[in-house]
Each structure stands twice: as C-alpha cells, then as structure tokens.
Amino acid sequence: EINGSANYEMFIFHNGGVQILCKYPDIVQQFKMQLLKGGQILCDLTKTKGSGNKVSIKSLKFCHSQLSNNSVSFFLYNLDRSHANYYFCNLSIFDPPPFKVTLTGGYLHIYESQLCCQLK
Amino acid sequence: EINGSANYEMFIFHNGGVQILCKYPDIVQQFKMQLLKGGQILCDLTKTKGSGNKVSIKSLKFCHSQLSNNSVSFFLYNLDRSHANYYFCNLSIFDPPPFKVTLTGGYLHIYESQLCCQLK
C-alpha cells in the first residue's frame, strides 16, 4: 500500500538540522522503518519482539533516531543544499499481520534560513 | 530490500512518450510490479499462477504495459514538464519464497526535445 504524500508535517527544522517524522499506526507492534533519500536507504530502525515479549531495537543503517509508540523520527544535521530531495518513510509492518509495506514521503526544500552555516 | 537507483537504462524516450523499464530476476514466477511517481501508485501489474499453472495477469491501476520474462515496461504518453519526478519500480515477489519487496528508481528529467508537442 502506498499512502503517497505524508498528510502531516514530515520535516521539522531546528538548529541547522532537520527532524524527519515517520508515523505508523498505534496498533503496530513490530516493524521496520527505513528513511529513503530518493531510492537509497539513508537510515533504518527495526523493532521486534521475542516469544517472551522482550523488545529488540536494531539499526543496520544507523542515524540518530527517536522512537515513540506511533512514530520514528530520524535526525539529519549540518544541512546543505545537497540535502534537498524526495524523502520517503518506508514502513514494513510485521505485526499485526498481514505483512504490509507502506511508503509515504515528500520533498525536502532547503532555504537559506535553514542551512547550518550561512555565509554572512 | 531497496536496490536504490536502477543500474540499467530505466527511461526510454520515443515519439513524445516514455517507456519506463522495471526489471525483475528471471527466476521470479509470481509478482506484483507497481510504478510509483514520487510516492503515488501510477500503474501496476500482478502476475500469478493458479493450481493448474494457469497464468493470471491483473491490473488495478491500468497503464499501457508490456510483460517479458524479466521485465515490465510501463508506457507514459504526451509528456509535459509535470512528468519530471522520481519514478520507482516497486516489486513484490511472491514466488519463489521468501516474500520480498524491492524498490528501484530514478529521476525522469524532461528536456524540450522529449516533449510531445513542442511550440514552434
């Protein structure tokens, strides 16, 4: 399932960096969230549970990230113009079944005021 | 699995239109291929087989398409500048198992020479 454009504010700028917000439904217990820049994996975070309900959080492509019960935020720092691109949150839902993949995204525009080190 | 940028010529221009080539491995017997523009599903094609090995080809979002034993081509016509975007081939492999999703894509640049109806 492709949700297309995120229907929420996906990019939150602060201090020359950006927080990219990837939401998922509260009901989702186990998943993999990937942040794609164009078609490349930039960051990922996988949450699974074992048979004793113990949670495991893993990252193969590590970025500074923050997990809540309905979102994963990935943080990119030292923004420059090369960061302008399409970004997608690629969510693979493992639990509850059925297995499902959703892709939501938007274009990250970089304006002078958001760059980390503006030339004076 | 995200393969990222297509490592082959994904866009083939002719007569003011474009053929978008979505490749898959020869070994794949049953699959769904979606063409995404940004994060939106533009076209899809699903190939499955019944118990008697009878092949079924289905399309929920229909575009002119062409199926070979290792690719699906989607055709877009009457190109204009609004077609410039990231396009992704989203392949879901059902058979052989395990179930797998791969995303490959690239940016479709539209130049004057490729437009269907250039202003003289």
């Epitope: 009901i27 217990q29 996988t46 074992g50 048979s51 004793g52 309900n53 113990k54 893993k58 | 395990p98």
Partner: antibody, heavy 117, light 111 residues
Framework: EVQLVESGGGLVKPGGSLKLSCAAS????????MDWVRQAPGKGLEWVGN????????EYSPFVKGRFTISRDNVKNTLYLQMNSVKSEDTATYYC??????????WGQGTLVTVSS | DIVMTQSPSSLAVSAGDRVTINCKSS??????????LTWYQQKTGQAPKLLIF???TRHTGVPDRFMGSGSGTDFTLTINSFQTEDLGDYYC?????????FGPGTKLELR
C-alpha cells in the same frame, strides 16, 4: 520453504555437556528471533529459551538458566544450544523453532537428548 | 510465571463431532487489542504445528473447521467437524511475558 534441522543429540551422563545445532534454510535467518523448545518423553511442550536476531539478547527458562547457553551464527544460518551440567530431567526431544513475530510458525523435526549414567 | 491449564486432558471423538478444548491462564493475556494466546497441534511422532495465533487468527493453510475464541483469561479451540487427520495433542501457549508457557495439552483419541 522454511527448513530447520536439529543435530547433536545423544546420550550424555549427568553433569556432562552437549551442544545441539539447528541448521536453518529457506528464509532470512538474521531477520528472526529463534527459540529452543523441549518435550520430555510422553510429556508436554516446555520452552527452553530464545535469542534475538543478531544474538545480543538471550532469555532462558528458570529450569535451565545458568546451565544452558543459546547462540547463533548468522553467516552459517545456524542456531546452537550449549547444554552444561545436565540433569536427568533434561532428557527430552529438543526442537528448534522460528519465532515468526507472533507465534512459533516453523519447527524442526527435533533431536533426542538422553541424560543417563 | 503465568500458568496455563487445559481441559479436558483427553477426549474420545468421532468423525463429524464438534470438539471443544478449553484453555485458562492465571492472568489476563490481553495487551492492547490482542490476546497473546496461540494454539498448536502435534500429531504422534511429529513436531508441533501452528494453528491459531492472537487467540482467533487462523494460520495460513489451516482448515476453517478450526476456530479460536476467547479473551483475557479464558480461551477455546473448536473443531467444527472433526476429521480423523485431526487426531493428536493440542496445546495452548502464551507469549504475554517471559517465560512463555504451554498448557499441559489435550489428547484427541478416536472413540
């Protein structure tokens, strides 16, 4: 097709050691938690322990904690159970099982461990 | 640890019978909107097989004569029209917390 094949079972003396292996194929082994479950002859199923996808977390049943160790090799697609200080009550068929996110969705055929002097 | 109990421990059945197996947990297995309760079938000399997960969801390929129900601490596995190939032992299992535990099992035998 998911396949799990246990090996390494046999006769072991009380206080002795034994290492069981489980060779996995047909799925991406490193994506799944894996478990060991045992069954004493004529009895019910008993969970032994589990290990997470990369081997950094392992949990054990109170009956085996401190004596048994679960490990995995994701390059060889193999799960292990190192059994030390075995007791007669450890006699059982040991099954390797894939934890398919919300249930044991695939099981091996089992390997019999007999603890006897 | 959560204790799982099953009743009956054994049951004599005939083809076509409606079979009911009960499972009780010593504390609620409900978390959010899910009951962390699973049913397995084990035929003689074979490994267990997954039948039902989340108390009521049939695993892929499981015939629709198998039905799971219940919530909280009380669960039921129903076989609507028993077939001879359904002979074997049935276990309930929880994965609410560690250690996950199995019920003692229910043996279905031919009458």
């Amino acid at each position: 097709e998911v396949q799990l094949v246990e090996s390494g079972g046999g006769l072991v003396k009380p206080g002795g050691s034994l290492k069981l292996s489980c060779a996995a194929s047909g799925f991406t082994f490193s994506d799944y938690w894996m478990d060991w479950v045992r069954q004493a002859p004529g009895k019910g199923l008993e969970w032994v322990g589990n290990i997470d996808e990369d081997g950094s977390i392992a949990e054990y049943s109170p009956f085996v904690k401190g004596r048994f160790t679960i490990s995995r090799d994701n390059v060889k697609n193999t799960l292990y159970l190192q059994m030390n200080s075995v007791k007669s009550e450890d006699t059982a068929t040991y099954y390797c099982s894939r934890w398919g996110r919300f249930a044991f969705d695939s099981w091996g055929q089992g390997t019999l461990v007999t603890v006897s002097s | 640890d959560i204790v799982m109990t099953q009743s009956p421990s054994s049951l004599a059945v005939s083809a076509g019978d409606r079979v009911t197996i009960n499972c009780k947990s010593s504390q609620s297995l409900l978390s959010g909107s899910f009951n962390y309760l699973t049913w397995y079938q084990q035929k003689t000399g074979q490994a267990p097989k997954l039948l039902i997960f989340y108390a009521s969801t049939r695993h892929t390929g499981v015939p629709d004569r198998f039905m799971g129900s219940g919530s909280g601490t009380d669960f039921t596995l129903t076989i609507n029209s028993f077939q001879t190939e359904d002979l074997g032992d049935y276990y309930c299992h929880h994965h609410y917390n560690a250690p996950p535990t199995f019920g003692p099992g229910t043996k279905l035998e031919l009458r």
